[in-house]
Amino acid sequence: TLNSVLNSNAIKNLPPPLGGAAGHPGSAVSAAPGILYPGGNKYQTIDNYQPYPCAEDEECGTDEYCASPTRGGDAGVQICLACRKRRKRCMRHAMCCPGNYCKNGICVSSDQNHFRGEIEETITESFGNDHSTLDGYSRRTTLSSKMYHTKGQEGSVCLRSSDCASGLCCARHFWSKICKPVLKEGQVCTKHRRKGSHGLEIFQRCYCGEGLSCRIQKDHHQASNSSRLHTCQRH
């Protein structure tokens, strides 16, 4: 129930002491290193790890990717799986843990020694000459945004939406992914079922923009076979 959710959070996630500062949003506060709020653990363990159902990598955590749990299993059932470490087999970048990427079916390091050239073999665009390193906490696919240095414009190759400029998302286009515009009000959108059927999409659409959601178009004049058309509509 909602109450149990809220009560559990009231225990686990306590804000800083109120002390009257709340009326002054200009000041910032953060958890000091080593301070744990009741029930909170800054260094989250995965002892109680529960596989989470997903439809795409972006629904998973930064150390996970979305796939069928069994090799050759039902493509309709996907969960978030732990990312693959260096030298493990992979089929796409998202399968590799942060600081790595998928090259020739193997997860390899994306540190500055290997970084240049290797990725440019897999992404055929020029992204400048600066040699950036990846910090250990970055999302594995911020590897691409750190490589590009400027956010990808429409049509740029990307790995994740965070690689793309504001107003764009990273979506499949044939067998690669490119930055495409986030959908505006009235534009046709794809309402994904939880089973992850859109993994088969060749031309993936972006999600709806801020303040919009993908809902069935309530147009009674449409033919019955197109009555399932979804468009981006105001909340």
């Epitope: 959710v5 809220l6 559990s8 959070n9 686990k12 996630n13 804000p15 953060s30 958890a31 744990l36 709020y37 029930g39 909170g40 653990n41 800054k42 989250q44 995965i46 790890y49 529960q50 989470y52 997903c54 795409e56 972006e58 629904e59 998973c60 955590g61 930064t62 150390d63 996970e64 978030c80 942060p98 910090d135 906490y137 970055s138 999302r139 911020t142 994740r160 939406s161 965070s162 999600y207």
Partner: nanobody
Amino acid sequence: EVQLVESGGGLVQAGGSLNLSCTASGSAFSSSVVGWFRQAPGKEHEFVTGINWSGARTYYADSVKGRFTISRDNAKNTAYLQMHSLKPEDTAVYYCASGRDRYARDLSEYEYVWWGQGTQVTVSS
């Protein structure tokens, strides 16, 4: 380490709207979950809404569903909370919080370890 600063709070009449922002400093924001919590006078703080690192997943408490919208722009290190059709019972101090999003779970179940100072939202009848 992530530092969070909320803005956009204020006084509004019932039925009105407010837009809160939560701006983060620190490189970890784009790989962090973000949640909005609130605490009304004399009440326990409650989880209002959350969004995962990519924006692909969101969660809303029943009390705000259909009225509040959470979003984020990782390029700007900012999360947003659009609040419409506000009610007097929405009056509270609103906190933005974040935590590492390494392993997916229900957005109400994350450990939110970094907190903003809070911004006051007052809805008058």
